[in-house]
């Protein structure tokens, strides 16, 4: 299996944005790569977003995706937005080297993303 590295812990910003790097040790010269972010919480795994990209090109997520990203060599910079406290969980980076064959699959150990909802502003008396 291909090795995938990602940070153990990331704290989302007060605006609910979390960014982390997903790095893979490519055993071959892939031209087409698929990156998938999975969220594991309470032993349930769900797909957060996925993108396929050509090496050297930008990642293209679906228009309604909460993810954006850029790639550089064997590194993918992933940003997840719109996070709330309830989205706290383990976010796993899955990398697939699709073409040319052979196919390689690597799954990271996950990044624990902590999301803290901002305190509401107290009402002002005028």
């Amino acid at each position: 299996a291909m090795h995938v590295a990602q940070p153990a812990v990331v704290l989302a910003s007060s605006r609910g944005i979390a960014s982390f790097v997903c790095e893979y040790a490519s055993p071959g010269k892939a031209t087409e790569v698929r990156v998938t972010v999975l969220r594991q919480a309470d032993s349930q795994v769900t797909e957060v977003c996925a993108a396929t990209y050509m090496m050297g090109n930008e990642l293209t997520f679906l228009d309604d995706s909460i993810c954006t990203g850029t790639s550089s060599g064997n590194q993918v910079n992933l940003t997840i937005q719109g996070l709330r406290a309830m989205d706290t969980g383990l976010y796993i980076c899955k990398v697939e080297l699709m073409y040319p064959p052979p196919y390689y699959l690597g799954i990271g150990n996950g990044t624990q993303i902590y999301v803290i909802d901002p305190e509401p502003c107290p009402d002002s008396d005028f």
């Epitope: 087409e32 699709m98 073409y99 040319p100 064959p101 052979p102």
Partner: antibody
């Protein structure tokens, strides 16, 4: 039900051109790579070309590189093979096939016959 | 290119017989070995992928085995409807290549 229907074959003179089409239905076309495979009369199967689901990756057999062009239109659920500079040895039944992992062709069309002869 | 060599090129067996077809790759293809069946005058159909996994709708009398460079397709009990040419195909490296085929007939 997965369905692949090829069209565009016919008789063409050496050096001529043809454009094959493959209409796909019964599955999400944009999720799958697609391939063309041919079979000369009385012979075995020969892989011709492949295009990935989003058309990022395109590959050809050595003998077809520069003469054949594979393309797809995901909005129309269609696959194409533009064949130029055709030779007698290109005479075959051309099959369009769906190709998922593990680089296997899991569903095939009924084929369209290409005959290159003067 | 990876060469795929099938043997025998043809065979004749009786209904109920166990039939074995072998496929040898010119180099290690890991588990990227697929088998196809083509009945006379018909379209090829995927039988087995990843060496041993049956494609949907394929009868359980078909099985695949092997590793590395040597692979086998077995029909445990030959049926009249199994008359066909069987092809192996490697997906490990481009160009994808097929074996020359094994024609199976009923005695």
């Amino acid at each position: 039900e997965v369905q692949l229907v090829e069209s565009g074959g016919g008789l063409v003179k050496p050096g001529g051109s043809l454009r094959l089409s493959c209409a796909a239905s019964g599955f999400t076309f944009s999720d799958y790579g697609m391939a063309w495979v041919r079979q000369a009369p009385g012979k075995g199967l020969e892989w011709v070309s492949f295009i990935s689901n989003l058309a990022y990756s395109v590959y050809y057999a050595d003998t077809e590189t520069g003469r054949f062009t594979i393309s797809r239109d995901n909005a129309k659920n269609s696959l194409y093979l533009q064949m130029n500079s055709l030779r007698a040895e290109d005479t075959a039944v051309y099959y369009c096939a769906r190709s998922g992992l593990p680089y296997a062709m899991d569903y095939w069309g009924q084929g369209t016959t290409v005959t290159v002869s003067s | 290119d990876i060469q795929m060599t099938q043997s025998p090129s043809s065979l004749s067996a009786s209904v109920g017989d166990r039939v074995t077809i072998t496929c040898r790759a010119s180099q290690d293809i890991s588990n990227y070995l697929n088998w196809y069946q083509q009945k006379p005058g018909k379209v090829p159909k995927l039988l087995i992928y990843y060496i041993s996994r049956l494609h949907s709708g394929v009868p359980s009398r078909f099985s695949g085995s092997g590793s590395g460079t040597d692979f086998t397709l077995t029909i445990s009990s030959l049926q009249p409807e199994d008359v066909a040419t069987y092809y192996c195909q490697q997906g490990r490296m481009l160009p994808w290549t097929f074996g020359g085929g094994t024609k199976v007939e009923i005695k």
